[in-house]
């Protein structure tokens, strides 16, 4: 059956032979209605990429550099399956390119000019492409030929395989630049030896190199890693201090109609039958015909790449930046230490309009990027299409797991002028009911619930976390009879109560009328039994404070809070009747942009923050008539974090633990991708 066939692309006679053997052996173990293999032979990996894009083939396995080519338009391929190395219990699908230095040296990443460098080899990922790509814009002009620019940047180097005649400085530390193990400084171990012997000041290798060459921890402690933020970390902290994370070897397919489920079904079956130590007749990860045919011989198996993970996310911002710099050879005109405009990520068109107005008023210091969901915005910040946004704590957690950092906190209670330097304790997550109802925390089963959105703190993580510990399962849509929790599956009972309008029904953005704090409260007013919101929501939308038709006549005393002990209290008493304390919303950014974002925002709030009294004739950053656009409307200021500058420190141990527990029930495709 053609639609059940995976056309594998082979790039040599030997690969084609192995592919035919793969096809025949799979036929013998799979049912006739299961997936099958067909083989397509092309002259090169690039030809395979083009063939897949043109629907003449379906899959091929590629190194990271080629995954980049495959992702570029017009190819638009995506990673679907990753080879893993190491054990099934601790599968490694990536390695980290690192810059290793001796502990007793005192320079940082931005002080490499004039140092001596050790490289694994010319044109190799960890040893050349990544470090030189990331340093590209610091190289002296002209940057072509690249080898000459690098030779003029460092005071001496060992770059195995370089042309020692044309670029003698590149071979200064290893005369002749031998391109094999005859050169003692060749490849990973060689580059590390070049540093160890004192020939070089920095070695560009992969994270495992240090461990493979120094079994003794005391010896490893003599070395450190250079981080991109111009700090240093110990060699075991490579996950937080690397030049780039590099995928090892990846199966790619078309982004649309790419048969990724079928490819996974095929490869999963293949590894069961013909994986490591499975069969004598045919081995997926070796071949009598040659090395690394179709798959790497060192691979131990396959892992499915999460569906939310596109090539940009898979390759990572640093890797793409490095390769793009090398390939395109373009650098910004502004010096790299100058802050470029900050691209704010706006959620759907309501936020985009406010962002546009901010952009006009900021004299171009703010630019705007849009996405339909918070997770899409986070992904855009990760890959450099956007720079920053303000997030509820639940999304600060997801953003943190995806490598972003908190930059400033929204403060709600501290009056100026101390606001900017005050760390607030947070706000209260509360459960609100109508005073006329007889509901308590203990009899919510079967009732109608209203949530700010799935994944948000007060509206989801805190109440559902508490509920989970009571009911011990994730079927929240069965616990409540119906509800509105924007971001739920469209056919779920937790979308039934949402108001839409239609194409935007249950979408986690302002196009859904019941989205956010005000939306969840409106849902309670109009349809629901309980709303999970922040403690300020009821006072902010009653007594005429919200002029919208549905809210203008509401009275605060018509609503009460549910306490965890089964009692109820007035909405004026959240300190004595709440579900938990929630961390304030916070601005997040990529690490490399954090300082610029902070500086710019502190400047912007001085002009457009809560000191502006007349928002009808001036732009106000923290005002959007109860819609919480870009920032919460009750924000007094954005405050410095001081030492709370990681998501764990910012959110606090208790909240991180609660959200981590709820991950059993996670419906976050982005979180799944970021923890792959």
């Amino acid at each position: 059956v053609p639609e059940k066939s995976v056309r594998w692309c082979a790039v040599s006679e030997h690969e084609a032979t192995k592919c035919q053997s793969f096809r025949d052996h799979m036929k013998s173990v799979l049912p006739s209605n299961g997936p099958s293999v067909a083989c397509v032979k092309k002259a090169s990996h690039l030809d395979c990429i083009r063939a897949i894009a043109a629907n003449e083939a379906d899959a091929v396995t590629l190194d990271a550099g080629l995954v980049y080519d495959a992702y570029l338009a017009p190819n638009n391929l995506k990673p679907v399956v990753a080879e893993f190395y190491g054990s099934k219990e601790d599968p490694q699908t990536f390695y980290y390119a690192v810059a290793v230095v001796k502990k007793d040296s005192d320079f940082q990443m931005n002080q490499l000019r004039g140092r001596k460098s050790c490289h694994t080899g010319l044109g190799r990922s960890a040893g050349w492409n990544i470090p030189i790509g990331l340093l590209y814009c610091d190289l002296p002009e002209p940057r072509k030929p690249l080898e000459k620019a690098v030779a003029n940047f460092f005071s001496g180097s060992c770059v195995p395989c370089a042309d020692g005649t044309d670029f003698p400085q590149l071979c200064q530390l290893c005369p002749g630049c031998g391109c094999s193990t005859l050169n003692q400084y060749f490849s990973y171990s060689g580059a590390f030896k070049c540093l160890k012997d004192g020939a070089g000041d920095v070695a560009f290798v992969k994270h495992s190199t240090i461990f493979e060459n120094l079994a003794n921890k005391a010896d490893r402690d003599q070395y450190e890693l250079l981080c991109l933020d111009n700090t240093r970390k110990s060699v075991d902290e490579y996950k937080d201090c690397h030049l780039a994370r590099v995928p090892s070897h990846t199966v790619v397919a078309r982004s649309v109609g790419g048969k990724e489920d079928l490819i996974w079904e095929l490869l999963n079956q293949a590894q069961e039958h013909f994986g490591k130590d499975k069969s004598k007749e045919f081995q997926l990860f070796s071949s009598p015909h040659g090395k690394d045919l179709l798959f790497k011989d060192s691979a131990h198996g396959f892992l499915k790449v999460p569906p939310r993970m596109d090539a940009k996310m898979y390759l990572g911002y640093e890797y793409i930046t490095a390769i793009r710099n090398l390939r395109e050879g373009t650098c910004p005109e502004a010096p790299t230490d100058e802050c470029k405009p900050v691209k704010w990520c706006a959620l759907s068109h309501h936020e985009r309009l406010k962002c546009d107005e901010w952009s006009v008023n900021s004299a171009g210091k703010i630019e705007c990027e849009s996405a339909e969901t918070t997770e899409d915005c986070i992904a855009k910040i990760m890959n450099g299409e956007a720079d920053a946004m303000s997030l509820d704590g639940g999304f600060v957690y997801i953003a943190g797991m995806c490598g972003l950092v908190p930059v400033l906190a929204e403060n709600y209670n501290t009056p100026n002028p101390n606001c900017e330097n005050t760390a607030e304790e947070g706000y209260f997550a509360v459960a609100v009911v109508k005073s006329s109802s007889d509901l308590t925390w203990d009899n919510l089963k079967g009732k109608k619930s209203c949530h700010t959105a799935v994944g948000r703190t007060a509206g989801w993580n805190i109440p559902m976390g508490l509920l989970y510990s009571k009911i011990n399962h994730c079927r929240f849509d069965e616990f409540f009879s119906e509800g509105c929790a924007p971001g739920s599956e469209k056919n779920s009972s937790l979308c039934k109560l949402c108001m839409g309008p239609s194409p935007n029904l249950c979408e986690p953005n302002n196009k859904e009328g019941y989205y956010g704090y005000t939306g969840a409260f409106r849902c309670l007013v109009e349809k629901g039994d309980v709303a999970f919101v922040k403690h300020q929501t009821v006072p902010q939308n009653t007594g005429g404070k919200n002029p919208d038709a549905w809210a203008k006549n509401l009275k605060e005393e018509d609503y009460e809070l549910l306490c965890l002990d089964g009692s109820r209290k007035s909405v004026q008493e959240p300190a004595n009747c709440h579900l938990a304390r929630a961390p304030n919303h916070a601005v997040v950014a990529r690490k490399d942009k954090a300082d610029c974002v902070q500086t710019l925002l502190l400047d912007q709030q001085r002009m457009f923050g809560s000191s502006v009294t007349d928002c009808s004739s001036n732009f106000c950053l923290f005002e959007s008539k109860t819609k919480d656009l870009l920032f919460r409307d009750d924000t007094v200021c954005l405050a410095k974090l001081h030492d709370r500058n990681t998501y764990e420190k910012y959110l606090g141990e208790e909240y991180v633990k609660a959200v981590t527990n709820l991950r059993k029930c996670s419906t976050s495709p982005l979180l799944e991708a970021c923890t792959f």
Epitope: K354, V360, N361, A363, S617, N618, K627, L629
Partner: nanobody, 117 residues
């Protein structure tokens, strides 16, 4: 709420010019920001140019150097002068003072600009 009405659109050849006007039903002196947006068929509405109360301006990259936004507070009107028009400038052009557009999808009729030979 001030009502805004756009005019001045029309059919023009590539390279030609047009001047769009946005007349307000009341005073625009105290309006913080006014802007022109455009929407081409099947595309999202996008910011073309904006002007603050103090007169500072911002332009979309695609129109920089060709379009100029200005406001005449005495006449309660905002203008968009468009030069060197290109076929990709074809769209319905809308004016906004942002006072209602954040919250409701409140836009005027707009004025059609068609650039074609």
């Amino acid at each position: 709420q001030v009502k805004l009405e756009e005019s001045g659109g029309g059919l023009v050849q590539p390279g030609g010019s047009l001047r769009l006007s946005c007349a307000a039903s009341g005073s625009i002196v105290s309006i913080a920001t006014m802007a022109w947006y455009r929407q081409a068929p099947g595309k999202q509405r996008e910011l073309v140019a904006g002007i603050t109360r103090g007169g500072s301006t911002k332009y979309a990259d695609s129109v920089k150097g060709r379009f100029t936004i200005s406001r005449d507070n005495a006449k309660n009107t905002v203008y968009l002068q468009m030069h060197s028009l290109k076929p990709e400038d074809t769209a319905v052009y809308y004016c906004t003072d942002y006072s209602r557009t954040y919250y409701e999808d409140h836009w005027g009729q707009g004025t059609q600009v068609t650039v074609s030979s």
